[in-house]
């Protein structure tokens, strides 16, 4: 059965936008005016996972690209990557765990926790123009809070 999806952009709590940095990496930086068109548009799909009032499992694909954010072990450390998939098979309701993020809403802000690696979150650095990564701490220097902006399809 088809999976429900919506198109959106994400900004971290410092209002940094997410843009492509090479073919398989995202970075976060402040954008203004026409530069806002550079930010990536996600296709957020609602998928199998732990669901409650404030927690919804999602997969984050790049709109009209066969790329999904995924969480894998690299050198024994949970790592965020952009993974290429077969567009004939994705998105699907039951995504592999590495593609699943628990979208957690707290005080009008969103966190994205890895389903594969609990307590690891999509994170950005305080510094400008740095890669988006998977971080194992909340409330520290790194930013784990985001806002979501809906994009009409």
């Amino acid at each position: 059965a088809p999976v429900r999806s919506l198109n959106c952009t994400l900004r971290d709590s410092q209002q940094k936008s997410l843009v492509m940095s090479g073919p398989y990496e995202l970075k976060a930086l402040h954008l203004q005016g026409q530069d806002m068109e550079q930010q990536v548009v996600f296709s957020m799909s609602f998928v199998q996972g732990e669901e409650s009032n404030d927690k919804i499992p999602v997969a984050l694909g790049l709109k009209e690209k066969n790329l999904y954010l995924s969480c894998v072990l690299k050198d024994d450390k949970p790592t965020l990557q952009l993974e290429s998939v077969d567009p004939k098979n994705y998105p699907k309701k039951k995504m592999e765990k590495r593609f699943v993020f628990n979208k957690i809403e707290i005080n009008n802000k969103l966190e994205f926790e890895s389903a594969q690696f609990p307590n690891w979150y999509i994170s950005t650095s305080q510094a400008e123009n740095m890669p988006v990564f998977l971080g194992g701490t909340k409330g520290g220097q790194d930013i784990t809070d985001f806002t979501m902006q809906f994009v009409s399809s």
Epitope: A1, P2, Q48, K97
Partner: antibody, heavy 119, light 102 residues
Amino acid sequence: QVQLQQWGAGLLKPSETLSLTCAVYGGSFSDYYWSWIRQPPGKGLEWIGEIDHSGSTNYNPSLKSRVTISVDTSKNQFSLKLSSVTAADTAVYYCARASPSSGWTLDYWGQGTLVTVSS
Amino acid sequence: QSVLTQPPSVSVSPGQTASITCSGDKLGDKFAFWYQQKPGQSPVLVIYLDNKRPSGIPERFSGSNSGNTATLTISGTQALDEADYYCYAWADTYEVFGGGTK
């Protein structure tokens, strides 16, 4: 409290079509997936397929050519048809609900209906 | 077709810990579920999403899933835990049960 009540013919001849219906009482119908599972006597469980309220289906590839699952949202019911049955289709057939709160797995089951195929 | 393999039977004394395994290709990258079935009854969900317990399921039931193996653990087993146990996962667009463990 959710209840799934199922019924249908219990004795079939080879080549006939198995037909079962499951009625859902309590809880919303549109927020879930609805599944059929079977279990041959003394054997394990086999997933047959699922449907959502809009009529969108997924089937077990090994049965796909013979299976039709349909839904009647006005009655909160869903049905299974399995064509060209043989003795190998003799089993207890269960209907079940897949719920988002349990990760889209089967959290409520019907009581089961024994279907025997014999000439 | 995808295959989930379980041991046909596991035997323990009351009060001991029972571990039931379910193996399948890259199973740890999928969510695993476990059902308990007693004779003449419909299956009951005891573990969902690898390690979560539905309300009403005793704390002695726990689950884990990594690599190619999901495990259901029943600690401090009781006579009423005697049953068939089935693991359950998905493969692309369809669902698969393990063969069951008595």
